[in-house]
Amino acid sequence: MAVTACQGLGFVVSLIGIAGIIAATCMDQWSTQDLYNNPVTAVFNYQGLWRSCVRESSGFTECRGYFTLLGLPAMLQAVRALMIVGIVLGAIGLLVSIFALKCIRIGSMEDSAKANMTLTSGIMFIVSGLCAIAGVSVFANMLVTNFWMSTANMYTGMGGMVQTVQTRYTFGAALFVGWVAGGLTLIGGVMMCIACRGLAPEETNYKAVSYHASGHSVAYKPGGFKASTGFGSNTKNKKIYDGGARTEDEVQSYPSKHDYV
């Protein structure tokens, strides 16, 4: 019961986490700029992985996609890749974990198969969570680096003058969503891995089988010490070795030439 609960909870936590990673990846608010006032209008700028947006004090908002791939910073490309890998791994993990859930019966799937699938999905969730956390952290680091590099930066270009505007870019909501979602996916993955240990059978119980030995037709009879416990009809505390192939419930009631004290 505890295993089922752990597995189910791990699945739900991972599901929420992956939904969060998808949401963070699609959000525009990865970096937000403090309100910049100029003679025309107050401008609020925010950027995501896929487009950059500007909102004016009038409420008008314009978003432009990053249509070029070559002109984009390598770090931004890396963050995109990490987030997409995280989503793909998470989605595959969810698919695998659905079939691995103990509460869902699919044909005659054995517990060992479910255990393996649970472990696989757990590892996928852990890697997915780590990808999301890494992606968000790389972006955050890029923001911090850009802020310090842009401080008091001014240069002349093509006859005109280019001046860096001193407006601080802060961490957007998407970063926090990404960190939390990545953490949840990671926790869910760990829970799935813990559940896997409970699902895996500790030891395999084989049915008793007796074998005919060559030569004197001597066969070892499993459960031969059963009489010593005080149960069964053999009360002489004998080890029972029977030449015939019988089940363990057939206790010998007469002596034979193969009985040994």
Epitope: W30, S31, Q33, Y36, N38, V40, T41, V43, N45, Q47, S52, C53, V54, E56, S57, S58, F60, T61, E62, R64, Y66, G71, P73, M75, L76, F139, M142, L143, N146, F147, S150, G157, G160, M161, V162, Q163, T164, V165, T167, Y169
Partner: nanobody, 120 residues
Framework: QVQLQESGGGLVQPGGSLRLSCAAS????????MGWYRQAPGKQRELVAG???????NYGDSVKGRFTISRDNAKNTVYLQMNSLKPEDTAVYYC??????????????WGQGTLVTVSE
């Protein structure tokens, strides 16, 4: 790197018209504000007109009703239509744009200026 290309300046008679244009190129994500400033000899640089992406405009007191600013967002270009020009409009006109040029990077870029002379 962001570059501005200004054009349209020249000599014009009082009461005449001129159209200035300024095109931005380079690493550009957004251009929230585009505008024109001018600086007459021995005077401070002053705002002529500015326009936001959404079309919000602001004009300097001395040019209201005579000058019209417009922009083409697709071409990252701003235009200044100057009508009923006066001798006191003589100045170097500078294009000014606020450019979001990268992740966490906002630049204020100035053009090299184009001279407008209003004279008989």
């Amino acid at each position: 790197q962001v570059q501005l290309q200004e054009s349209g300046g020249g000599l014009v008679q009082p009461g005449g018209s001129l159209r200035l244009s300024c095109a931005a190129s380079g690493s550009i994500f957004n251009i929230p504000v585009m505008g024109w400033y001018r600086q007459a000899p021995g005077k401070q640089r002053e705002l002529v007109a500015g326009i936001s992406t959404g079309g919000t405009t602001n004009y300097g007191d001395s040019v209201k009703g005579r000058f019209t600013i417009s922009r083409d967002n697709a071409k990252n270009t701003v235009y200044l239509q100057m009508n009923s020009l006066k001798p006191e409009d003589t100045a170097v006109y500078y294009c000014n744009v606020l450019v979001v040029s990268g992740i966490g990077s906002t630049l204020e870029v100035w053009g090299q200026g184009t001279l407008v002379t209003v004279s008989e």
